[in-house]
């Protein structure tokens, strides 16, 4: 598989936003790349979000996606929003070179994202 690198650990902000870079070593000159973020928890793997982009163009997730991102060469900067403590888990970056053939696939080792829910503000008298 292709080599895919991502940070081991990221701490989400108090607003439930986590960002990390997913970098892949492309064997050649792909023009169409698909990036998928997967969440692994208790051996269950679920898709968080996915985007296909043309090299040199912006990364576009669906409008209702909790992910946003930008791309630069073989690097993708991913941001996941709306995270809560229960979303703490291992987030895996999957990269596929879709075009031109051949197809290449790479899976990162995962980024452990820790999310801490903010303490509610105390009522002021």
């Amino acid at each position: 598989a292709m080599h895919v690198a991502q940070p081991a650990v990221v701490l989400a902000s108090s607003r439930g936003i986590a960002s990390f870079v997913c970098e892949y070593a492309s064997p050649g000159k792909a023009t169409e790349v698909r990036v998928t973020v997967l969440r692994q928890a208790d051996s269950q793997v679920t898709e968080v979000c996915a985007a296909t982009y043309m090299m040199g163009n912006e990364l576009t997730f669906l409008d209702d996606s909790i992910c946003t991102g930008t791309s630069s060469g073989n690097q993708v900067n991913l941001t996941i929003q709306g995270l809560r403590a229960m979303d703490t888990g291992l987030y895996i970056c999957k990269v596929e070179l879709m075009y031109p053939p051949p197809y290449y696939l790479g899976i990162g080792n995962g980024t452990q994202i820790y999310v801490i829910d903010p303490e509610p503000c105390p009522d002021s008298d």
Partner: antibody
Framework: EVQLVESGGGLVQPGGSIRLSCAAS????????MNWVRQAPGKGLEWLAQ??????????YYSASVKGRFTISRDDSKNSVYLQMNSLKTEDTGVYYC??????WGQGTLVTVSS | DIQMTQSPSSLSASVGDRVTITCRTS??????LNWYQRKPGKSPKLLIY???NLASGVSSRFSGSGSGTDYTLTISSLQPEDVATYYC?????????FGSGTKLEIK
């Protein structure tokens, strides 16, 4: 048009050696990982070896059945990949295909190992 | 190495039938699965890559599905020219092994 043309097959005695070649054209050879796959008579497809390209430091991988006996190599200046096959056994008989990361395939070359 | 279990080993169906072939892997391969068609005396032909993507020039009768460890190749309406042996292959591993094959015949 993409083309992969294997050559070098033939009859070889058990314990002998043979070298297969695969000449590629119609795509950017140096951008791709190259593989050898075989099909023995009455058997299924068997992946044998892979050589990656320059960004991957030409890493090589082998199936357990050929490791230590077969060597894959490539010459990007000649758009060619090779399979050096040593210590051949009768069970190595089959049609050998080269493939550019399984998207493009050659027509195959027959290797027969027999005394 | 990742083990590939393909079933059935052979299959006989009628023209127009919907045909499914399955492939199970010994561990999660994250959709890194290809399907091939091989006709006697011909080179293997890539049908589906990345579990669900139709290769260029392949009839839309063919489709792939699945994730994790379970994958399926479906032929929506079997045609006489589909007689062949079909193989799955794990492309995630550095040792990209094939399934044992499914020989498809027409009744």
């Amino acid at each position: 048009e993409v083309q992969l043309v294997e050559s070098g097959g033939g009859l070889v005695q058990p314990g002998g050696s043979i070298r297969l070649s695969c000449a590629a054209s119609g795509f950017t050879f140096s951008d791709n990982w190259m593989n050898w796959v075989r099909q023995a008579p009455g058997k299924g497809l068997e992946w044998l070896a892979q050589i990656r390209n320059k960004p991957y430091n030409y890493e090589t991988y082998y199936s357990a059945s050929v490791k230590g006996r077969f060597t894959i190599s490539r010459d990007d200046s000649k758009n060619s990949v090779y399979l050096q096959m040593n210590s051949l056994k009768t069970e190595d008989t089959g049609v050998y295909y080269c493939t550019a990361q399984f998207a493009y395939w050659g027509q195959g070359t027959l290797v027969t190992v027999s005394s | 190495d990742i083990q590939m279990t393909q079933s059935p080993s052979s299959l006989s169906a009628s023209v127009g039938d919907r045909v499914t072939i399955t492939c199970r892997t010994s561990e999660n391969i994250y959709g890194g699965l290809n399907w091939y068609q091989r006709k006697p005396g011909k080179s293997p032909k890539l049908l589906i890559y990345g579990a669900t993507n139709l290769a260029s020039g392949v009839s839309s009768r063919f489709s792939g599905s699945g994730s994790g460890t379970d994958y399926t190749l479906t032929i929506s309406s079997l045609q006489p020219e589909d007689v062949a042996t079909y193989y799955c292959q794990n492309v995630l591993s550095s040792r990209p092994g094939f399934g044992s094959g499914t020989k498809l015949e027409i009744k």
